[in-house]
């Protein structure tokens, strides 16, 4: 039968190539059975994950899963890095895998690399 533990569906070693200046929503898909857990986002700094206190977040509910969303409006160059969501459930802390944002700081739309170029060039960081 289905587990009633909270599960956080962020893929291990997942990456997103995004453009500075664009809006972006980072989703933490959350599966739970009864009461929705308290979920937070943090940003990795070395081995510690620093809680993101003053950032805009929201919930999106779907039939079988909920999404805790971290909003970037807009994406800034220093948003580059790895993020993790965590859920508090019955006094347990459940942590997701980390997901990495690669932010490309492009000056004009004409200079923007294609999605395929960005996917294969994660060294284009600022």
């Amino acid at each position: 039968k289905e587990s009633c533990d909270v599960q956080l569906y962020i893929k291990r070693q997942s990456e997103h190539s995004i453009l500075a200046g664009d809006p972006f929503e980072l989703e933490c898909p959350v599966k739970y059975c009864a009461n929705r857990p308290h979920v937070t986002w943090c940003k990795l700094n070395g081995t510690t994950c620093v809680k993101l206190e003053d950032r805009q977040t929201s919930w999106k509910e779907e039939k079988n899963i909920s999404f805790f969303i971290l909003h970037f409006e807009p994406v800034l160059p220093n948003d580059n890095g790895s993020y993790r969501c965590s859920a508090n459930f019955q006094s347990n802390l459940i942590e997701s895998h980390s997901t990495t944002l690669y932010v490309t700081d492009v000056k004009s739309a004409s200079e923007r690399p294609s999605k395929d170029e960005m996917a294969s060039r994660p060294w284009l960081l600022y």
Partner: antibody
Framework: EVQLVQSGAEVKKPGESLKISCKTS????????IHWVRQMPGKGLEWIGR????????KYSPSFQGQVTISADKSISTAYLQLSSLKASDTAMYYC????????????WGQGTLVTVSS | DVVMTQSPLSLPVTLGQPASISCRSS???????????LNWLQQRPGQSPRRLIY???KRDSGVPDRFSGSGSGTDFTLKISRVEAEDVGVYYC?????????FGQGTKLEIK
Amino acid sequence: EVQLVQSGAEVKKPGESLKISCKTSGFNIKDTYIHWVRQMPGKGLEWIGRNDPANGNTKYSPSFQGQVTISADKSISTAYLQLSSLKASDTAMYYCASYEGYYERFGYWGQGTLVTVSS
Amino acid sequence: DVVMTQSPLSLPVTLGQPASISCRSSQSLLDRDGKTYLNWLQQRPGQSPRRLIYLVSKRDSGVPDRFSGSGSGTDFTLKISRVEAEDVGVYYCWQDTHFPYTFGQGTKLEIK
């Protein structure tokens, strides 16, 4: 039933290009990473790269970077491996594999596509 | 790149006897999430590979319990408690902790 069905065997000439497909069913392709692996005749397995069908992000082995393009169309649950400027040394069996991305709970392999490059 | 070294490369075994394959990695496969991403694959003659073991010791569904995986860090072992005829083929270890992911050279298991 879980299936990864790859396109059929191909015979190509040097310099030509080729796109192999891997049609998945029985699971949600967005929950997985699709890997591509090469096996040259009588040899071992070599990791080419992987694609995240959920967002299109792709990672390549440096040994294959620039020689291949990996992609996926999540709307039809199909992954692709494109080989360009084929050489005789590209003759090999190419496998797709689908691994669950969250907890590694499954890892399925396609039946392989034999590519022969010969003038 | 992480180099995966298997031994032996050839393993003749008598039916019903145990078999053991070693896999060593050139660096630790322990990921920052505390898990170790080491898989064992079986490739029977003329077939595509099949995952037997993941996360060092977890058996895939449908894999007989005579197969077991163990190890940590850089040193891993696949054991078959009693070899059967259907176990003939090549066994590969595969790490997916560090990019690029890498395979061992393969160990060919044959019946004596």
